[in-house]
Interface confidence: low
């Protein structure tokens, strides 16, 4: 019976050309994490594996970076990286708990006054 | 040493296939992933695709559903099936791995596919 429950920084905010960290935070639970993906849509930004670490696409290799923890800091924001996130922990015995985040990238001066999403 | 040695290509006609091979030896541990790149003439060199040691592939955009990417890890080998080729995908393709996580740490010295009619 899967118990654990995925806790993320929600919907979030930040300007064009600067950076974020995406984090999510496996609770609830004693299973094993064993990787964690991150994931952008359908595409595979990173893995995190407990037995051979990091691994970043390479595509993303210049502007995605690990850490902290498990979590996902992205660099050098434009307007295309604004949509959804997600954390796909792998676990033993469980299975796979899935967080989502939503990151909406802004303009500058639209950031500088206070258009942000709230985090829960 | 370690040495990435790449072999396979050659000249193709539009719409036909080529296996590249990668070689790796002299590793003290097992890469944790291996990957392409390819360069075109005139052109920066590109990402093509990558596996990792557990087994995970991910692609570009650009041979998505073409190109398919293997390993065999008892051999340290990796592979590159190319179908559907196109002119566009002319290009010295280059063989590259990593053992610790961040750098690509391994090139090979690249083999040349032409897709030419």
């Known amino acids: 019976m899967m118990t654990g429950t995925i806790e993320t920084t929600g919907n979030i905010s930040a300007e064009k050309g600067g950076s974020i960290i995406l984090q999510c935070h496996l609770s609830s639970t004693t299973a094993q994490v064993t990787q964690v993906n991150w994931e952008q849509q359908d595409q595979l930004l990173a893995i995190c594996n407990a037995d051979l670490g990091w691994h970043i696409s390479p595509s993303f290799k210049d502007r995605v970076a690990p850490g902290p923890g498990l979590g996902l800091t992205l660099q050098s924001l434009t307007v295309n990286d604004t949509g959804e996130y997600f954390c796909i922990y792998h676990t033993y015995p469980d299975g796979t708990y899935t967080g989502r985040i939503f990151l909406e990238v802004l303009e500058s001066s639209v950031a500088e006054h206070g258009a942000r999403f709230q985090i829960p | 040493e370690v040495q990435l040695v790449e072999s396979g290509g050659g000249l193709v006609q539009p719409g036909g296939s080529l296996r590249l091979s990668c070689a790796a030896s002299?590793?003290?541990?097992?890469?944790?992933?291996m990957g392409w790149f390819r360069q075109a003439p005139g052109k920066e060199r590109e990402w093509v695709a990558s596996?990792?040691?557990?087994?995970?592939?991910w692609y570009a955009d650009s041979v998505k559903g073409r190109f398919t990417i293997s390993a065999d890890n008892s051999k340290n080998t990796a592979y590159l099936q190319m179908n559907s080729l196109k002119p566009e995908d002319t290009a010295v393709y280059y063989c590259?791995?990593?053992?610790?996580?961040?750098?690509?740490?391994?090139w090979g010295q690249g083999t040349l596919v032409t897709v030419s009619s």
């Open positions: 590259a791995s990593e053992v610790a996580s961040g750098e690509t740490d391994y």
């Open positions: 002299g590793f003290t541990l097992s890469p944790s992933w």
């Open positions: 596996v990792l040691r557990g087994g995970y592939t």
